[in-house]
Interface confidence: low
């Protein structure tokens, strides 16, 4: 039964500079906007609320929780009013690594 | 327009005013009579691009929603000695 | 329908080490979830001590002497809490987050009231 | 770590609406639950996510959060309603669930 929701590994009907990246390593999480708004000062949200002092294309979180920071984030550039959404949740832990069974 | 996420005890559900459109990524199975798609178990961690169904003149109203679960189900914890 | 049922000892001597145990049914313990112990001191409030979702978080009122497991095959996790003193007499509460309400506690057990005394 | 902060008792009058505060600093920005605990029960959450309300609760009981205050609010207090009512939240940088010391409602 649950054969049928394991996610596909053949992400290609969608460019590839319209997707987030999220890198995690330990505890911290990276994710990156999509390239679709170039290089321009970007803004971040957090469930609809505005990220202070993250502009970069990168927001990271060094100490992820996953009760508190799971939810949508967006992020937009000043000069493009479209938003990118993302909604993510992630478990992390300190001292662990993710094996491919 | 904006699909919504809702976790139902271990499950991943989408949700639109409309119906949802996968885009890529899990496939879900649509709920009969309803506008939710069921991505499945959440230890499984689904991932994809989702977006509501709309006309051609409203699909600038619908934006992509990248859902991403890492759920950790797969993770092995190190200790000093590993 | 999810229940939890807490069980140990009624009475423990100080500097001894508290066991207690929760049993989940109506579902399973897995790491898709976070498996809480809660105290409540008589006349207090609620006190978060830790969970268990395959790796281990505790309060820091706690560490070193707390110890949360899970025995997935019997459905049930486990308090430790060493070096008991009179302080830990209180009613303790095993706790599982709802499917919809991330880090909050929608499941309850009743409580098992643990008195410290010599 | 993160302090919430909860006056010990409040009288309300039954049937009127009565309103049960939790402070803590920028709480406005973090997830807020509610919990009821009547007399030697385990307690119920009443409120998620500062303002759902689980199937089974009645919907007198409401929430709100914003800025440095969460409220509960009972929109016309019954004889029942009379408990202890507990805030939490998640305090990511002490990795820690946090409750406040918890509000008891008389119901007069």
């Known amino acids: 039964q649950d054969e049928d929701f394991k996610a596909s590994d053949d992400l290609t009907s969608i460019s590839p500079e319209k997707r987030f990246k999220v890198s995690i390593s330990g505890t911290e999480v990276v994710v990156t906007c999509p390239d679709v708004f170039g290089y321009d000062n970007i803004k971040w949200e957090k469930n609809d609320n505005l990220v202070e002092g993250a502009s970069n294309r990168e927001l990271s979180q060094k100490e992820f929780s996953e009760v508190d920071d799971s939810g949508y984030y967006a992020c937009y550039a000043d000069s493009i009013k479209e938003k990118s959404y993302l909604y993510l949740r992630a478990r992390v832990c300190a001292n662990c690594i993710e094996v491919n069974l | 327009f904006k699909v919504s996420v809702e976790e139902l005890e271990d499950r991943v559900f989408l949700s639109c005013n409309t119906s949802v459109l996968r885009i890529e990524g899990t496939m879900g199975i649509q709920l009969p009579h309803s506008r939710t798609l069921d991505l499945g178990k959440r230890i499984l961690d689904p991932r994809g691009i989702y977006r509501c169904n709309a006309t051609e003149e409203q699909s600038d109203k619908a934006p992509y929603m990248q859902v991403y679960y890492r759920m950790c189900q797969n993770c092995v914890e190190l200790n000093s000695a590993t | 329908e999810l229940t939890l049922q807490e069980s140990g000892p009624g009475l423990v001597k100080p500097s001894q080490t508290l066991s207690l145990t929760c049993v989940v049914s109506?579902?399973?313990?897995?790491?898709?979830?976070?498996w809480n112990w809660i105290r409540q001191r008589p006349g207090r409030g609620l006190e978060w001590m830790g969970y268990?979702?395959?790796?281990?978080i505790y309060n820091p009122t706690f560490q070193g002497r707390i110890s949360i497991t899970a025995d997935t095959a019997k459905s049930q996790f486990s308090l430790q809490l060493r070096s008991m003193t009179t302080e830990d007499t209180a009613m303790y509460f095993c706790?599982?987050?709802?499917?919809?309400?991330?880090?909050?506690?929608?499941?309850w057990g009743q409580g098992t009231l643990v008195t410290v005394s010599s | 770590s993160y302090v919430l902060t909860q006056l010990p008792s409040k009288n309300v009058t039954l049937k009127q609406p009565a309103h049960i505060t939790c402070g803590g600093d920028?709480?406005?920005?973090?997830?807020v639950h509610w919990y009821q605990q009547k007399l030697g029960q385990a307690p119920v959450m009443i409120i998620y996510?500062?303002?759902s309300r689980p199937t089974g609760i009645p919907e007198r009981f409401s929430g709100a959060n914003s800025g440095n205050t969460a409220t509960l609010t009972i929109s016309g207090a019954l004889a029942e309603d009379e408990a202890d009512y507990y805030c939490q939240v998640w305090d990511s940088s002490a990795k820690a669930a946090v409750f406040g010391g918890g509000t008891h409602l008389t119901v007069l």
């Open positions: 268990w979702t395959g790796s281990t």
């Open positions: 920028k709480i406005g920005s973090k997830n």
């Open positions: 706790a599982r987050e709802g499917g919809k309400s991330l880090g909050a506690f929608a499941y």
């Open positions: 109506g579902g399973s313990v897995t790491r898709s979830y976070y």
């Open positions: 996510y500062d303002s």
